[in-house]
Structure formats: structure tokens, C-alpha cells
């Protein structure tokens, strides 16, 4: 699966929740950043994900599509510089600090299981998406389509009205 | 090369049925979420309905619902729909749509030519 | 449920001229915004995608713009092959196009 472009096609300032609506918060602890999936205090302000919309092509011998064989690809970047990435040794979901281009790990197949929910496809190992596990993201193998509609992995992307992120 | 052929259109009386079917060929059909949306002599583009790769989510217009059913054969390449207790409003021409990515409900890469349907006694 | 609104209804042109064309969405659609060309007796036909992508094989005198509930078609030289009902589409929350908005040459 290869990036047609360097530059995103669209970028959208989003918070993330749960199918169930918990919340996906991103806290700094000892230099690092941690991710947590928790219920949030009914004013708590949301922590906001900025996802960056990438074109990508099927490989070739994948789809019979030939240019119309396109995928969307997110990156997600809940703060400036540090970006999701997938531990496929780990199975975890961990934030690092990165410099453009992103690495491999820092790209998900975008999936629309339903149309207001949305779940993240490892770029480094396809099968296996972003999910819940323990109050926590990790690397979920999914093993046909048919699990593809399993909640753990379904996100909810909600609008937000700010346009810059911290 | 992307093709989807509409079929199934025709004249029926109110409170009747029809079926339209779509066959779509020249991309990975189960890859891809198929959309049906009509448009009535002379008037505006109007979204019917929706169905997601592997056919286990579905979704209407409200006007619709519960009367149109939109169900595929991922195996034959074909997207279908089911149109009970037609009313002389759903007369118009009805275009299957692909989407324009795999895995993702956003946009309409592709349309087919359309098929006339007209509810009339 | 999201509303689409498109104005004009109609716009009257001259070959070469700049033309824009309005669409305003009744909630922030997140750049989720689509255009479609419709000529008569064809299908529609996507033209640009994600409010500013262009289709493959548009031409490039095509294009778009926006944020939030307002967004733009312009075609910055308008040619006799442009003569066409334009419709803005939302796919942020379900789908919904607007009414359109028909390109008439003077």
C-alpha cells in the first residue's frame, strides 16, 4: 500500500470515543504520553485528535481496481508532533514523537463499519486494527469481516468547533 | 474498466413492488460500499440508501424506510433493491453508486446510467 | 439531519467568465463536501471530493474551497462543455445533496 501524496487530501479536528462511548484521552506522564479509555465527567472537555486524510493505492495484485483502487490512510495526532503508532510486536497503541514523513506504523486503513463510526487498520500489519482492551488502545487481530463490526474496535468521531490543536 | 448496469425499472401501480438490481464490474466489488439514490423528472439528486461492505449495516432515507429494503451478493457482483408499497412520489430514476474508496462511506466514485421507475395506475 | 442549500438556482454566464457557485450546510460538515456534475440525459459524475480534491480527469479550471457550513465550486474559465446542473453533497452525519445549481452559457 503506498501514500499517493506527501500532503494530506483533508485534515479534521476530532475527539475520539468509544462505541460506548468512552472517551480516548491522552495525559503527559514522566515525558511520555499515555492514552487512557475512560468515562468522562459530564462538562470534562474532551481531548481533541487531529486526523490527517491520506489517499493510498492498493497493491496491484490485491484489487482489479487499477486507479480506482484507492483507500483513505489517517495518521491521528492528539498533540503537535507526537503521533499514534502501531507496536505490532507489543500489540499496543503507542504515541511517539515523530518528524515528517511518518513512519509506516503511524498510518491506519480508514474503515467505515457503520455510517457515523469508524475503525483504524494497522498500515504495518493488515487484520489487525486499533481497539479496546483493558481501558486501554491496543492492536486487536480481527480475524474475517464478519468481526469487523465487533465494538471494541468501532470509534466515534465527534465534530469539533475548535480549529487549532494544542 | 468500472461498470455498474442498473436494471429492473419499469412502470408498476401504486402499492405494488419492484426490485432493481445493479451489477457492477471492473473493481473488487466487496470492497466497497454500494449506495442506490434517485432523481425524479426534472428535479434534484435525492440519496435512497446505503450498504457497507460486507451488507451488515443498512441505512434509509426516512421516506423510505420501512417500505425499500437494500441488500448485495458480494459472490455475483450485485447490489440489490427491493421496493414495496411503491407511491406515485418514488417515481423517478434510480442510480447505483459505488463508493469512491474501499472500506469508506464518502463520496460517489462511480454511477451507473440509471433506470426509470414509474408508479402510475 | 443535515440541510444543503445551493445558490443561485440558476446562473447565466459567458464563455471565458469566472463562476461561482454557494453551498451552505445547515451544520459544520468538516470539509466532508462533495461536487457533482450532472449534464443532461448523463449520470452524475464526481468532480471534486474532501471540498478541494479534484476527480482524476477533471480539468483543472475546476475547483473548490470552504469550511464549516460554507463551501465554493469555481470554474475560473468557463467552456460550452460546463453547461450542466452542479450538486454540492454532504457525507459528514448520513448524505444529502443539495437542490442544484444549473450553469447556463449567455
Known amino acids: 500500500m503506498s501514500i499517493t501524496g506527501i500532503s494530506p487530501i483533508t485534515e479534521y479536528l476530532a475527539s475520539l470515543s468509544t462505541y460506548n462511548d468512552q472517551s480516548i484521552t491522552f495525559a503527559l506522564e514522566d515525558e511520555s504520553y499515555e492514552i487512557y479509555v475512560e468515562d468522562l465527567k459530564k462538562d470534562e472537555k474532551k481531548d481533541k485528535v487531529l486526523l490527517s486524510y491520506y489517499e493510498s493505492q492498493h497493491p496491484s495484485n490485491e484489487s482489479g481496481d487499477g486507479v480506482d483502487g484507492k483507500m483513505l490512510m489517517v495518521t491521528l495526532s492528539p498533540t503537535k508532533d507526537f503521533w499514534l503508532h502501531a507496536n505490532n510486536k507489543e500489540h499496543s497503541v503507542e504515541l511517539h514523537k515523530s518528524e515528517k514523513p511518518l513512519p509506516d506504523q503511524a498510518f491506519f486503513v480508514l474503515h467505515n463499519m457503520h455510517s457515523n463510526s469508524v475503525s483504524f487498520e494497522s498500515k504495518t500489519d493488515p487484520g489487525v486494527f486499533i481497539g479496546v482492551k483493558d481501558n486501554h488502545l491496543a492492536l486487536i487481530k480481527v480475524d474475517s469481516s464478519e468481526n469487523l463490526s465487533t465494538e471494541n474496535i468501532l470509534f466515534k468521531l465527534s465534530e469539533t468547533h475548535h480549529h487549532h490543536h494544542h | 474498466e468500472v461498470q455498474l448496469v442498473e436494471t429492473g425499472g419499469g412502470l408498476v401501480q401504486p402499492g405494488r413492488s419492484l426490485k432493481l438490481s445493479c451489477v457492477a464490474s471492473?473493481?473488487?466489488?466487496?470492497?466497497?460500499?454500494m449506495y442506490w439514490i434517485r432523481q425524479a423528472p426534472g428535479m434534484g439528486l435525492e440519496w435512497v440508501s446505503s450498504?457497507?461492505?460486507?451488507?451488515?449495516?443498512?441505512y434509509y432515507l426516512d421516506s423510505v424506510k420501512g417500505r425499500f429494503t437494500i441488500s448485495r451478493n458480494n459472490a455475483e457482483n450485485t447490489v440489490y433493491l427491493q421496493m414495496n408499497s411503491l407511491r406515485s412520489e418514488d417515481t423517478a430514476t434510480y442510480y447505483c453508486?459505488?463508493?469512491?474508496?474501499?472500506?469508506?462511506?464518502?463520496?460517489?466514485?462511480?454511477w451507473g446510467q440509471g433506470t426509470l421507475v414509474t408508479v402510475s395506475s | 439531519d443535515i440541510q444543503m442549500t445551493q445558490s443561485p438556482s440558476v446562473l447565466s454566464a459567458s464563455v471565458g467568465d469566472r463562476v461561482t457557485l454557494s453551498c451552505k450546510a445547515s451544520?459544520?460538515?468538516?470539509?466532508?463536501l462533495d461536487w457533482y456534475q450532472q449534464k443532461v440525459g448523463e449520470a452524475p459524475k464526481l468532480l471534486i471530493y474532501?471540498?478541494?480534491n479534484l476527480q482524476t480527469g477533471i480539468p483543472s479550471r475546476f475547483s473548490g474551497s470552504g469550511s464549516g457550513t460554507d463551501y465554493t465550486l469555481t470554474i475560473s474559465s468557463l467552456q460550452p462543455e460546463d453547461v450542466a446542473t452542479y450538486f454540492c453533497?454532504?457525507?459528514?452525519?448520513?448524505?444529502?445533496f443539495g437542490q442544484g445549481t444549473k450553469v447556463e452559457i449567455k
Open positions: 453508486a459505488k463508493g469512491h474508496y474501499s472500506y469508506s462511506s464518502y463520496s460517489f466514485g462511480y
Open positions: 471492473g473493481f473488487t466489488f466487496s470492497n466497497y460500499w
Open positions: 450498504i457497507n461492505n460486507d451488507g451488515g449495516n443498512t
Open positions: 451544520h459544520n460538515i468538516n470539509k466532508h
Open positions: 474532501f471540498t478541494n
Open positions: 453533497f454532504q457525507y459528514n452525519s448520513g448524505w444529502t
